[in-house]
């Protein structure tokens, strides 16, 4: 997945940290304060969506197939440019209780983005 | 230290309608949801739904859906219930509770509420 | 929706007595989202009880809670005299969120 660098409007991944100060959930979330959760941003034009390295499947790049030939339904939907790779953290955080809880939490951080 | 504060008691005719507000201090206001729960004189607790103060979308009980809007005005911290087309059975008192509501981190119960608004519906 | 039933309607007690509330809901609770409140008459629930058996900040020793997917218990293991009120549980893990229709512990 690509880097956006300012220099290409491709589907690509944007650095984005998010500070939990921010959202109102410091008071409880002990650690870490923040993070990069990045997000996706770009256009996904026809020859690159489903292309290897940036599809989200080997159902996008079939799907891509007959939208490229203008096959109906197909013909009218438009490739999204959507998080392909997703990591966990480890968060600290405090129950209802005031209990300290250590949970690896799924899906927190975008790795690669990619064309749906 | 966490306190909700809620508007005083009403007293409506049948027919009209009801806005009750709860004041949110002593933490970040837009980092929990704020629902509302109704208690008639004598009975058990009703929950009416819920608002995210951070978006403002709503989740309301079906019973309620159409008469029931509930809104948050993040600049004073304080969340709105109001209550449209009164009958008398709709004497309660109101509830404002706030509550974590976060899947991957664990859902919370409604660990703080406010003290309560007597509405009465009387013609 | 999911409904909780509770039982009995009312528990006559002793101070110093074991009270034992039970909750029964319609369908599982998902991920043991539930709670117990404690409610006096013209005050504001009290959470006693959530995650099914953890205790709130501040709450004694002597109330606990049990149980997961549709059966759960609250136990006060001794009553004091302020333990006599209503005792009502909620599910939190789906919407609409939904309460019991409440015990009431008095003195016998």
């Known amino acids: 997945g690509l880097e956006c660098d300012g220099k290409v409007n491709i589907c690509c991944k944007k650095q984005f940290f998010v500070s939990f100060k921010d959202i109102g959930w410091n008071d409880w979330i002990i650690a870490p304060s923040g993070y990069h959760a990045n997000y996706c941003e770009g256009e996904c034009p026809s020859h690159i969506a489903g292309t290897s390295g940036s599809s989200l499947s080997f159902h996008s790049t079939v799907i891509n197939h007959y939208r490229m030939r203008g096959h109906s339904p197909f013909a009218n939907l438009k490739s999204c440019c959507v998080p392909t790779k997703l990591r966990p953290m480890s968060m600290l955080y405090y129950d209802d209780g005031q209990n300290i809880i250590k949970k690896d939490i799924q899906n927190m951080i975008v790795e690669e983005c990619g064309c749906s | 230290q966490v306190q909700l504060v809620q508007s005083g008691a009403e007293v409506k005719k049948p027919g009209a309608s009801v806005k009750v507000s709860c004041k949110a201090s002593?933490?970040?206001?837009?980092?929990?949801?704020m629902h509302w729960v109704r208690q008639a004189p004598g009975q058990g607790l009703e929950w009416m739904g819920v608002?995210?103060?951070?978006?403002?979308?709503?989740n309301y009980a079906q019973k309620f859906q159409g008469r029931v809007t509930m809104t948050r005005d993040t600049s004073i911290s304080t969340a709105y219930m109001e209550l449209s087309r009164l009958r008398s059975d709709d004497t309660a008192v109101y509830y404002c509770?706030?509550?974590?509501?976060?899947?991957?981190?664990?859902?919370?119960?409604?660990?703080?509420w406010g003290q309560g608004t007597l509405v009465t519906v009387s013609s | 929706e999911i409904v909780l039933t509770q039982s009995p309607g009312t528990l006559s007690l002793s101070p110093g007595e074991r009270a034992t509330l039970s909750c029964r809901a319609s369908?599982?609770?998902?991920?043991?989202?539930l709670a117990w409140y404690q409610q006096k008459p013209g005050q504001a629930p009290r959470l006693l009880i959530y995650?099914?058996?953890s205790r709130a900040t501040g709450i004694p020793d002597r109330f606990s809670g049990s149980g997961s997917g549709t059966d759960f218990t609250l136990t006060i293991s001794r009553l004091e005299p302020e333990d006599f009120a209503v005792y009502y549980c909620?599910?939190?893990?789906?919407?609409?969120?939904?309460f019991g229709g409440g015990t009431k512990v008095e003195i016998k």
């Open positions: 509770a706030r509550a974590r509501d976060i899947a991957a981190l664990g859902l919370g119960a409604f660990d703080y």
């Open positions: 002593g933490y970040t206001f837009f980092g929990y949801s």
């Open positions: 608002i995210n103060p951070s978006s403002g979308d709503t």
């Open positions: 369908q599982s609770v998902s991920s043991s989202y």
């Open positions: 995650g099914a058996s």
């Open positions: 909620l599910q939190y893990g789906s919407y609409p969120r939904t």
